[in-house]
Interface confidence: medium
C-alpha cells in the first residue's frame, strides 16, 4: 500500500512520542559518538519536518524515502569526518548504497565510557527536573552502545525504566526500591541486545533463508497446535520485521511489529492457547510478552514422522516439487514434536535430511538410500545432550565463578590470539549458562543451553570480525551458523601459538582493587588468569589453580592491611616470583 509520504504515514501510525524515540534510536545507532544534544537537535528537526508532511503530504521533500531523509539529516553533522573518519565517505553515495555504508560502519564495541551509575539522589533529581530529557538520554546511551538493539523492544525497556523511577523516587528507601530494578533492566537489556545481535548476524551473514529456518523451528516449538500455513505466515512477517530493524528501518520495523502482534492476538485460537494474557496488555508489553510466551502443549496423538518423510514413496517427488516448502514442513513437524531440542539441533537435523535427499533422490533406488536417514540423527542429538550433562555436572561441582574460570582456560587455550577483554567477557557469559540452564529439568536443558551458547558465541564472532586475529575463530564463525558451537567445542589446544612474553606489569595490582565490587574484582582476577594461560598455554589445571588461589589470598591479605599500597607492591613482587617458579616461566 503506497503512501504519498512515507514519513507522514509512519508519524501517523506510530504517534509523535514513539516516532521521536525511534528516530533518536536510529540516529544514535548510526552515529554512536555524537553528543546527546546534537542528536536531540536532529530528531527535533526531523519531527518538525514530519509534521509539515502530515499537514500536507504533497509538500516539498515529503515524497522522499526515509533513508533519503534520515541520511541527508545525518550527513549535515559538521564533525562527521573528524569524528568518524571514513564513515564520512558514506555521504558521497546515493541511496540505497549510503544506508548500506552507514550499516557497515556500526561498531559493536564502540570506544565509549562505561555507564557508571551515580547516587540514587542524582538520578531521581535528574528524573524530576526533566523527565523527557532523562528518558531520551536512556534511549541514546543504550542505543549508541548497542547499535543492533531491537528498537521497539528498547521502547519497552524505556517504559519500564520510567516506571521504576516514578515509583522509587517517591519511596521511603529510594535505593532499596530502585537499584534491584535497574540491575534487572541492565541484565535483561544485555541479554536482549545479544539475542537481537544474533538475529541480525543470521540475516546479514547467512541470509534470509537461514533466518526463516530458525524462525520456523522456534515458532513451531512455541505454537505446536498451529497449522504449517499459519506458522509460515508468522515466519514471513517476523522475517520482515527483523530485516527492517537490522537494516536500520526502525519506523517500519516498529509499525510492522505492532501489526504482527495485532494479527497474532486476533488469531490466537488458531495459534496458541498461551496468548490470552499477553493479548490483554498494552502494545509494548503485548509484543514483549508474545516474544517470550511459553510453548503451548503439543497436540495429542501426533503421527510418526517417518510415514511422510521416510516411508512414503513420494518423498523425492514432494521434495523436487518445492524443496524449501518440503524442508520447511519437515522442520515444522520435527520442531513441534521436540520442544526438548535446541533450535540449532533441529536445524542440524533438517540440514542432514536435506543433504540426504539431495544425494538419494539422484540415486538408482532413492527409498533404499534414504531409508535409514533418521539413524543419522542419533549422534547429532547425543552430542549436545552429553556436552550439557558433563558441563552441568562441572558447574554444580565448581559454582559459577570457578566454572567460568574453567571455561576461560579452555577457550584461551583454543584461541589464545583473541584479546584478553574479549576472552574474559565471552567466557564469563558462557559460564552463566550454568546458573541459567542447569537448574532446568532434562526436557528444558538443551533448548536453554545450546540456544543461549549460540547467542554468546555470536558475541565472540562479531567482536572478532572487527579485528580478526584467529583463523580458527573466523572458520568457526563463518562456515555454518548452526555448527558454530560444535565447531568451537571441537577445537583443541592451539599448538601453533607462540606464548606471550612475560610482563610483570600485567600482574601488578594496586589498592584500588579493594574498593571494586565483587564482580569487578572477579574480572580483574579472570583477566590475570587469561594472561597466565597466554604466557604458559601448557600449564596444568593444578598449576593454574595453585597460582589463582595464591592470588586470591594475596588480594585478601593486602586489602586488610593498614598500608594497602605498600602491601600490594611488596607482596605482589613475591607473588609474581612464586608464580613464575610454579609455572616455570
Amino acid at each position: 500500500d503506497a503512501h504519498k509520504s512515507e514519513v507522514a504515514h509512519r508519524f501517523k501510525d506510530l504517534g509523535e512520542e514513539n516516532f521521536k524515540a525511534l528516530v533518536l534510536i536510529a540516529f544514535a545507532q548510526y552515529l554512536q559518538q555524537c553528543p546527546f544534544e546534537d542528536h536531540v537537535k536532529l530528531v527535533n528537526e526531523v519531527t518538525e519536518f514530519a509534521k509539515t508532511c502530515v499537514a500536507d503530504e504533497s509538500a516539498e521533500n515529503c515524497d522522499k524515502s526515509l533513508h533519503t531523509l534520515f541520511g541527508d539529516k545525518l550527513c549535515t553533522v559538521a564533525t562527521l569526518r573528524e569524528t568518524y573518519g571514513e564513515m564520512a565517505d558514506c555521504c558521497a553515495k546515493q541511496e540505497p548504497e549510503r544506508n548500506e555504508c552507514f550499516l557497515q560502519h556500526k561498531d559493536d564495541n564502540p570506544n565509549l565510557p562505561r555507564l557508571v551509575r551515580p547516587e540514587v539522589d542524582v538520578m531521581c533529581t535528574a528524573f524530576h527536573d526533566n523527565e523527557e530529557t532523562f528518558l531520551k538520554k536512556y534511549l541514546y546511551e543504550i542505543a549508541r552502545r548497542h547499535p543492533y538493539f531491537y528498537a521497539p523492544e528498547l521502547l519497552f525497556f524505556a517504559k519500564r525504566y520510567k516506571a521504576a523511577f516514578t515509583e522509587c523516587c517517591q519511596a521511603a528507601d529510594k535505593a532499596a526500591c530502585l537499584l534491584p530494578k535497574l540491575d534487572e533492566l541492565r541484565d535483561e537489556g544485555k541479554a536482549s541486545s545479544a539475542k537481537q545481535r544474533l538475529k541480525c548476524a543470521s540475516l546479514q551473514k547467512f541470509g534470509e533463508r537461514a533466518f526463516k529456518a530458525w524462525a520456523v523451528a522456534r515458532l513451531s516449538q512455541r505454537f505446536p497446535k498451529a497449522e504449517f500455513a499459519e506458522v509460515s505466515k508468522l515466519v514471513t512477517d517476523l522475517t520482515k520485521v527483523h530485516t527492517e530493524c537490522c537494516h536500520g528501518d526502525l519506523l517500519e520495523c516498529a509499525d510492522d511489529r505492532a501489526d504482527l502482534a495485532k494479527y497474532i492476538c486476533e488469531n490466537q485460537d488458531s495459534i496458541s492457547s498461551k496468548l490470552k494474557e499477553c493479548c490483554e496488555k498494552p502494545l509494548l508489553e503485548k509484543s514483549h510478552c508474545i516474544a517470550e510466551v511459553e510453548n503451548d502443549e503439543m497436540p495429542a496423538d501426533l503421527p510418526s514422522l517417518a510415514a511422510d518423510f521416510v516411508e512414503s514413496k513420494d518423498v523425492c517427488k514432494n521434495y523436487a516439487e518445492a524443496k524449501d516448502v518440503f524442508l520447511g514442513m519437515f522442520l515444522y513437524e520435527y520442531a513441534r514434536r521436540h520442544p526438548d531440542y535446541s533450535v540449532v539441533l533441529l536445524l542440524r537435523l533438517a540440514k542432514t535430511y536435506e543433504t540426504t535427499l539431495e544425494k538419494c533422490c539422484a540415486a538408482a533406488d532413492p527409498h533404499e538410500c534414504y531409508a535409514k536417514v533418521f539413524d543419522e540423527f542419533k549422534p547429532l542429538v547425543e552430542e549436545p545432550q552429553n556436552l550439557i550433562k558433563q558441563n552441568c555436572e562441572l558447574f554444580e561441582q565448581l559454582g559459577e565463578y570457578k566454572f567460568q574460570n574453567a571455561l576461560l582456560v579452555r577457550y584461551t587455550k583454543k584461541v589464545p590470539q583473541v584479546s584478553t577483554p574479549t576472552l574474559v567477557e565471552v567466557s564469563r557469559n558462557l559460564g552463566k549458562v550454568g546458573s541459567k540452564c542447569c537448574k532446568h529439568p532434562e526436557a528444558k536443558r538443551m533448548p536453554c543451553a545450546e540456544d543461549y551458547l549460540s547467542v554468546v558465541l555470536n558475541q565472540l564472532c562479531v567482536l572478532h570480525e572487527k579485528t580478526p586475529v584467529s583463523d580458527r575463530v573466523t572458520k568457526c564463525c563463518t562456515e555454518s551458523l548452526v555448527n558454530r558451537r560444535p565447531c568451537f567445542s571441537a577445537l583443541e589446544v592451539d599448538e601453533t601459538y607462540v606464548p606471550k612474553e612475560f610482563n610483570a606489569e600485567t600482574f601488578t595490582f594496586h589498592a584500588d582493587i579493594c574498593t571494586l565490587s565483587e564482580k569487578e574484582r572477579q574480572i580483574k582476577k579472570q583477566t590475570a588468569l587469561v594472561e597466565l594461560v597466554k604466557h604458559k598455554p601448557k600449564a596444568t589445571k593444578e598449576q593454574l589453580k595453585a597460582v589463582m588461589d595464591d592470588f586470591a589470598a594475596f588480594v585478601e591479605k593486602c586489602c586488610k592491611a593498614d598500608d594497602k599500597e605498600t602491601c600490594f607492591a611488596e607482596e605482589g613482587k613475591k607473588l609474581v616470583a612464586a608464580s613464575q617458579a610454579a609455572l616455570g616461566l
Partner: nanobody, 115 residues
Framework: QVQLVESGGGSVQPGGSLRLSCAAS??????MGWFRQAPGKQRESVAA???????KYADSVKGRFTISRDNGKNTVYLQMNSLKSEDTAVYYC???????????WGRGTQVSVSS
C-alpha cells in the same frame, strides 16, 4: 532544577595556572566531571572524580590538571597548571563522571591560553 555554575576562567599565557570552580545548586552530587569544548570541536571529558574519591584524567592533561572537591560547599575544582594553547576552550562541569552528564549544561567558563 539543578543548576551548575562554573567560574574561574580567564586569559593566561602558556605555562600559567588557573583554578576553576563548579557549584552545584542544592546539594553535593557524586560523581562529578569536568569537560571542555574547543571551537568547532566536540565536547570532551577532561577529568572526573568518583564517589570514592578516585580520579581519572584525559591523557592530554595528566600531570598538569588536578580535580578535587569540597563536599561541604557542594563544589568541585579543577586546578590547571602548565597551561598550553591547546587547553583553550569553554570548560563545563556536570554530574556523572567520565563522559556522562546527568544535568543540563551550565554556561561554562572560558579559558584562553595565548602569548
Amino acid at each position: 532544577q539543578v543548576q551548575l555554575v562554573e567560574s574561574g576562567g580567564g586569559s593566561v599565557q602558556p605555562g600559567g595556572s588557573l583554578r576553576l570552580s563548579c557549584a552545584a545548586s542544592g546539594r553535593n552530587f557524586n560523581p562529578m566531571g569536568w569537560f571542555r569544548q574547543a571551537p568547532g570541536k566536540q565536547r570532551e571529558s577532561v577529568a572526573a572524580i568518583g564517589t570514592d574519591g578516585s580520579t581519572k584524567y584525559a591523557d592530554s592533561v595528566k600531570g598538569r590538571f588536578t580535580i578535587s572537591r569540597d563536599n561541604g560547599k557542594n563544589t568541585v575544582y579543577l586546578q590547571m597548571n602548565s597551561l598550553k594553547s591547546e587547553d583553550t576552550a569553554v570548560y563545563y562541569c556536570n554530574v556523572g563522571g567520565w563522559g556522562i552528564s546527568w544535568f543540563p549544561w551550565g554556561r561554562g567558563t572560558q579559558v584562553s591560553v595565548s602569548s
